[in-house]
Amino acid sequence: MATAERRALGIGFQWLSLATLVLICAGQGGRREDGGPACYGGFDLYFILDKSGSVLHHWNEIYYFVEQLAHKFISPQLRMSFIVFSTRGTTLMKLTEDREQIRQGLEELQKVLPGGDTYMHEGFERASEQIYYENRQGYRTASVIIALTDGELHEDLFFYSEREANRSRDLGAIVYCVGVKDFNETQLARIADSKDHVFPVNDGFQALQGIIHSILKKSCIEILAAEPSTICAGESFQVVVRGNGFRHARNVDRVLCSFKINDSVTLNEKPFSVEDTYLLCPAPILKEVGMKAALQVSMNDGLSFISSSVIITTTHCSDGSILAIALLILFLLLALALLWWFWPLCCTVIIKEVPPPPAEESEEEDDDGLPKKKWPTVDASYYGGRGVGGIKRMEVRWGEKGSTEEGAKLEKAKNARVKMPEQEYEFPEPRNLNNNMRRPSSPRKWYSPIKGKLDALWVLLRKGYDRVSVMRPQPGDTGRCINFTRVKNNQPAKYPLNNAYHTSSPPPAPIYTPPPPAPHCPPPPPSAPTPPIPSPPSTLPPPPQAPPPNRAPPPSRPPPRPSV
């Protein structure tokens, strides 16, 4: 008894506040952001509920359990049915996807009067009748049964229940069992698909709420997206089907990807790999542009299908050979350009002294805001520079081969420490905004991964360019291949590295003054960090704007509560 209908043998006034809370929470079902997890799978869901005398004072808990779970399955293609059993099985609500009918069905469920024996097989019979009828109509939608019972089934009743559950399975259903209180787990494991398909609730009916999440996780089979969602007409492709629960099949070898083409022909393909959250499937070759293939998944070799709103469309793609030729031409041009660039280096080698750097090298940024080039530094304290007895540290900067002829010949003292810069260029740290927050990154684009790699390649090329450009002869330079010439500056070199400040007479213009290094922009920051978990793709049906109402509007007087 414990129903809203007579309404008594249930849980009493202490339930009223809890019921209100449950209804508020349940009203949020279907919105992943604030309503907890939800299921977007399109299949037929049957609740088979024990309403025998043993659940007399527990019907409220059963009702709230079903109500909360029902609101988590939010696909417009999901259909639901409520079946109750005691001495006989009754279909309280026939299979429907109509949210208003489901709301009414839940209202009726609340009015159930527990009583009678535990003839669970009667419940499975009512489910099988509907599955058989739906299959005969040609729908062949995947079926999931969630059966709830609270007691041990006597020998004959267990035999009948197992037999009827097997019939439902033969029709393509996946069977889960929820056992509450005095259930026999071994029995339920045989009625359900396996031990993994049994949800034990040992702490009594009040603990039913605690398994909603795990039931949802295990029973939900959903297709969320396909990648790519557009394929080339006439080409063979592989499709990654993203979703959940693909390994919930009794046998993963029986999982199939199904493509319903233009709402007529259905092509089934065996996936290359089956993971819980994705399938890798060969896509059918669709000859014409504009063809649409609705994606479905079968967990039982095509006996029945989980539907989705995910569509794969075909588009016209240019011939690959044109692209190949274009790439080849581009490659040849690049080869010629490189040859043109590097050929003079083979023929004329000009060795000259690098003009000395300014006496005071500061670590600060250049006018363009970029740090200066780093050179290796030697702690010259050991040579006796800077102060009495050479105690104060003095750093001398080294050019590539020494900044002067003498410098080039200079050897390090045995105990001189050389610090090599860690990288040729230091890129400025990304500037922090106030309160240490990094500037928000731009949204990740489809080309972000490629762009990141190209940026890295570009940096390497620029480094190479800068190194080569220093050595590259200018138009006035002469020389033959493998004909080395040393050009010497007239200006005497002073040690240590302070030529810049020698002003007695201006030095003659050098044969070649290396151009300043090309300004080095730091590579653009990666387009975005790892993107946030995407909300379900736009191909999915949006969850209902407002979740289906949980109840009819309250009557003028509060309905009497079941007694406890």
């Epitope: 008894m1 129903t3 809203a4 209908e5 007579r6 309404r7 008594a8 043998l9 849980i11 009493g12 006034f13 005398g53 043993s54 007399l56 004072h57 527990h58 005691s86 006989r88 009754t90 009726e108 009015k111 159930v112 009067l113 009583g115 009678g116 209180k181 009594g204 009916f205 009040q206 309905p559 009497p560 509560r561 079941p562 007694s563 406890v564």
Partner: antibody, heavy 116, light 112 residues
Framework: QVKLEESGAELVRPGVSVKISCKGS????????MHWVKQSHAKSLEWIGV???????ATYNQKFKGKATMTVDSSSTAYMELARLTSEDSAIYYC??????????WGQGTLVTVSA | DIVMTQTPPSVPVTPGESVSISCRSS???????????LYWFLQRPGQSPQLLIY???NLASGVPDRFSGSGSGTAFTLRISRVEAEDVGVYYC?????????FGSGTKLEIK
């Protein structure tokens, strides 16, 4: 106010059937199930069963299975038919409403006398 | 079935006195939800039974607070303080824990 009105007394011969009624008023009939209780001199009070006025399904005391059949109709009336009457079936039969507090409302009772 | 046993079968009492009626069940009536499903009824002569106490200790609507119920899982007591003449009749206990619901045999309260 809530009222349960039972049909009048019945004098019947052994072996026949009798159908007694209980009409609910002052509330939404289908919101509350209906119990039937037998009171005889020998056995004091005995619970016969309860019927869902919404769905029409009933739960019986095993002892009364085959003897009593409970039904409801759209006129806010619950019925109980007693079959193959014997002198042991002579008693007062009450209907009582299920509720948050069950058995808070009772009909006035119907006396059934089985006599040759 | 759960068997309900009432004692004594009959109790004579003087108006203004207090009286206690006992009821025992063959099985604990304490449910896992915390409620004890024991009910007390009074049937006055020529009338239908009237609910006095529900779920062991809760007073039904319109019942004077001279009536009170107490007990454990299997032993229950209905206490009437300051008995009045209108309290005469047969008192029944009933278990509402599981089907079939069962009644005690009744205790007849008489005025001395």
């Amino acid at each position: 106010q809530v009222k349960l009105e039972e049909s009048g007394a019945e004098l019947v011969r052994p072996g026949v059937s009798v159908k007694i009624s209980c009409k609910g008023s002052g509330y939404t009939f289908t919101d509350y199930a209906m119990h039937w209780v037998k009171q005889s001199h020998a056995k004091s009070l005995e619970w016969i069963g309860v019927i869902s006025t919404y769905f029409g399904d009933a739960t019986y005391n095993q002892k009364f299975k085959g003897k009593a059949t409970m039904t409801v109709d759209s006129s806010s009336t619950a019925y109980m038919e007693l079959a193959r009457l014997t002198s042991e079936d002579s008693a007062i039969y009450y209907c009582a409403r299920e509720d948050y507090v069950p058995f808070a409302y009772w009909g006035q009772g119907t006396l059934v006398t089985v006599s040759a | 079935d759960i068997v309900m046993t009432q004692t004594p079968p009959s109790v004579p009492v003087t108006p203004g006195e207090s009286v206690s009626i006992s009821c025992r069940s063959s099985k604990s009536l304490l449910h896992s939800n915390g409620n004890t499903y024991l009910y007390w009824f009074l049937q006055r002569p020529g009338q239908s039974p009237q609910l006095l106490i529900y779920r062991m200790s809760n007073l039904a609507s319109g019942v004077p607070d001279r009536f009170s119920g107490s007990g454990s899982g299997t032993a229950f007591t209905l206490r009437i303080s300051r008995v009045e003449a209108e309290d005469v009749g047969v008192y029944y206990c009933m278990q509402h824990l599981e089907y079939p619901f069962t009644f005690g045999s009744g205790t007849k309260l008489e005025i001395k």
